[in-house]
């Protein structure tokens, strides 16, 4: 007696999909795949599967339901911070092949890495034309100001909203300031924190307010406070540079921009007699701080005049440094003062047309705005490698 | 709270235009796609028109296509949809509803009456 | 154009019992990970309400009575028990593509 069984039913592939191998019949032990095009998977039910393989069983039937090729999804976009998702494909649309826009808040914010655009590709992934599977970023445009030059803060005036935006006040112990840098770190000067350099929390940090003693400001707080390793307290004021790490993000508007780091070229805006521009709340002529932000339009001093400035007595040898700027004028009347510590001495680029910091307030005269003598700053653009390093490693 | 407001409805005559607006609050209007969906006396929803977050992808119902304009102002957080060339069967209750995927807010509506 | 077909148009279901509502569509409006088929309820003189997304994911502060399922094209939506307040008329919705359709509705009248 003998049985031949029987052969199983034709596969049908699924939509989007192919059997192999192609066969006249499949009998006892015959066997094919199912293989997904580009940009579908296997799903049997709502499972998807690695692969599929049926076996032709004796009763003539396959050991395994025919699976799906289902379309691809790489589900909603990830938000981004500052910035939005556009479908461009249709609304909603997260299916192989599909476009999103990606595109950063208008005005105070640029998109860094890529162009935004991104699309859904068969592994799942939203994919940008580079190939990037992560986000772009969203980098809040710096230098940005109500004013647009350096015109004529002690001998100073009175600021304008959106004039100084990126100016901090900082309380902690003293009055000191700081430059907002990006939108969660401070530049500010290492003499200014250098007490609470092991207490970061204790620093109050305000900004996006004119006003000292405003109630309505932008509160942050210090995650951590970073010295410059060549600084010494109590020994002269090279490196007097400094970084606090925000513990969140701020959020830019006109009032709250930060202040541009110094490209290479940026020495051309810098020579002897430029005009920079301090602003604080440090010490006015009446020998009180600034109950209002205030600023003056200073220039730069010769660096071996202003050198020859505080080499006499009672300062000592060589306390003005190669990291350091001088401003003012000769005749007084014009400088920074005690509780501007900190806070930036900007200039206006007039090739990307925004304000960089090239000076940290630091120190001077125990007399502001005397005549013969100068304000110094900590000279910023030789320590941008020092700065990019703690703001990439942090 | 989120909010949408609609405006503009009324009595037009067939082949005339109106422009309807939603004004939205409670929340980032520019970060939501926003769409325009109708009703019908005594009848079922019809999805409209869609518009992107930024505004640079829209995508209209054939039987509104060429004849219905759909467009956003994020500065004043307010869509519009202009319509031309209207017709009997335009009349209903026309809604604003937030949300790329799906319609997650709607407005209370404004009503469109075409009649001569 | 997808077309969605649900049914019935209109059902009455005594108060504290389960109502079932149908939705089929014309394609599959599922994905390998998504399946976007959404309901809503309408109430005479007001506008729509989601109540579920994704064909089962309920939408915040829907009651858990409210429960949906199905995937490929069919999908269902259930009710229990059912309550006084949930006269209204029901909706599926797809945003498989554009345009994005609705059913026809479906009349729920509580006995």
């Known amino acids: 007696y003998t049985s031949t069984a029987q052969p199983c039913p034709y596969p049908m592939a699924p939509p989007n999909g192919h059997v192999s191998p192609v066969q006249a019949k499949y009998i006892l032990k015959d066997s094919f795949s199912i293989f997904c095009e580009t940009g579908y998977e296997l799903l049997q039910g709502h499972l998807p599967l690695k692969s599929f393989t049926a076996v032709c069983q004796k009763d003539g039937s396959w050991d395994r339901p025919m699976p799906a090729c289902s379309i691809v999804d790489c589900g909603p976009p990830d938000d981004l911070p500052s910035g939005r998702v556009e479908y461009i494909t249709g609304p909603g649309v997260t299916t192989y092949k599909a476009v999103i826009q990606y595109s950063c808040e208008e005005t105070f914010y640029t998109m860094k890495v890529n162009d935004g655009k991104y699309v859904c590709e068969a592994d799942g992934f939203w994919t940008s034309s580079k190939g990037e599977k992560s986000l772009p970023v969203c980098e809040p445009v710096c230098g940005l100001s109500a004013r647009t030059t350096g015109g004529r803060i002690y001998g100073g005036q009175k600021a304008k909203p959106g004039d100084f935006p990126w100016q901090v006040l900082i309380l902690g112990g003293t009055t000191a300031a700081g430059a907002l840098l990006y939108d969660n770190w401070v530049l500010t000067a290492a003499h200014a924190v250098y007490e609470q350099k092991h207490d970061a929390s204790a620093l109050d940090i305000r900004m996006g307010t004119l006003k000292r003693l405003s109630p309505h400001y932008t509160q942050a707080w210090s995650e951590a406070v970073f010295i410059h390793e060549g600084y010494t307290h109590d020994a002269g004021f090279d490196n007097d540079i400094a970084l606090i790490k925000l513990n969140n993000k701020v959020v830019i508007n006109s009032n709250i921009t930060p202040i541009c780091l110094p490209r290479k070229e940026a020495e051309s805006f810098m020579r002897t007699d430029d005009i920079g521009t301090a602003s604080g709340w440090g010490l006015t002529q009446r020998g009180f701080l600034a109950r209002n932000l205030m600023y003056v339009d200073i220039p730069i001093v010769d660096h071996q005049k202003c050198t020859a400035a505080y080499e006499k007595p009672p300062y000592p040898r060589g306390s003005v440094t190669a990291n350091m700027l001088c401003a003012g004028l000769e005749s007084g009347g014009k400088d920074s003062c005690r509780g501007d510590s900190g806070g930036a001495l900007v200039f206006l680029d007039s090739e990307t047309e925004r304000w960089f910091v090239g000076g940290i307030v630091s120190w001077g005269s125990m007399n502001c705005g005397e005549a013969g003598q100068y304000g110094v700053y900590t000279k910023v653009i030789n320590y941008i490698p020092w700065i990019e390093n703690i703001i990439s490693d942090f | 709270d989120v909010q949408l407001v609609e405006s503009g409805g009324g009595l037009v005559q067939p082949g005339g235009s109106r422009k309807l607006s939603c004004a939205a609050s409670?929340?980032?209007?520019?970060?939501?796609?926003i769409h325009w969906v109708r009703q019908a006396p005594e009848k079922g929803l019809e999805w409209v028109a869609y518009?992107?977050?930024?505004?640079?992808?829209?995508f209209y119902a054939d039987t509104v296509k060429g004849r219905f304009t759909i467009s956003r102002d994020n500065s004043k957080n307010t869509l519009f949809l202009q319509m031309t060339s209207l017709r009997s069967e335009d009349t209903a209750i026309y809604y604003c509803?937030?949300?790329?995927?799906?319609?997650?807010?709607w407005g209370q509506g404004t009503t469109l009456t075409v009649s001569s | 154009d997808i077309v969605l077909t649900q049914s019935p148009a209109s059902l009455a279901v005594s108060l504290g019992q389960r109502a079932t509502i149908s939705c089929r569509a014309s394609?599959?409006?599922?994905?390998?990970?998504?399946?976007?088929i959404h309901w809503y309820q309408q109430k005479p003189g007001q506008p729509p309400r989601l109540l579920i997304k994704?064909?089962?994911n309920l939408e915040s502060g829907v009651p858990a009575r409210f429960s949906g399922s199905g995937s490929g094209t069919d999908f269902t939506l259930n009710i229990h028990p059912v309550e006084e307040e949930d006269t209204a008329t029901y909706y599926c919705?797809?945003?498989?593509?554009?345009?994005?359709?609705f059913g026809g509705g479906t009349k729920l009248e509580i006995k």
């Open positions: 394609q599959s409006v599922s994905s390998s990970s998504y399946r976007y």
């Open positions: 994704y064909a089962s």
């Open positions: 919705q797809h945003s498989w593509e554009t345009p994005w359709t």
């Open positions: 409670g929340f980032t209007f520019s970060n939501f796609g």
């Open positions: 509803a937030k949300s790329d995927r799906y319609f997650d807010y």
């Open positions: 518009i992107s977050s930024g505004g640079s992808a829209v």
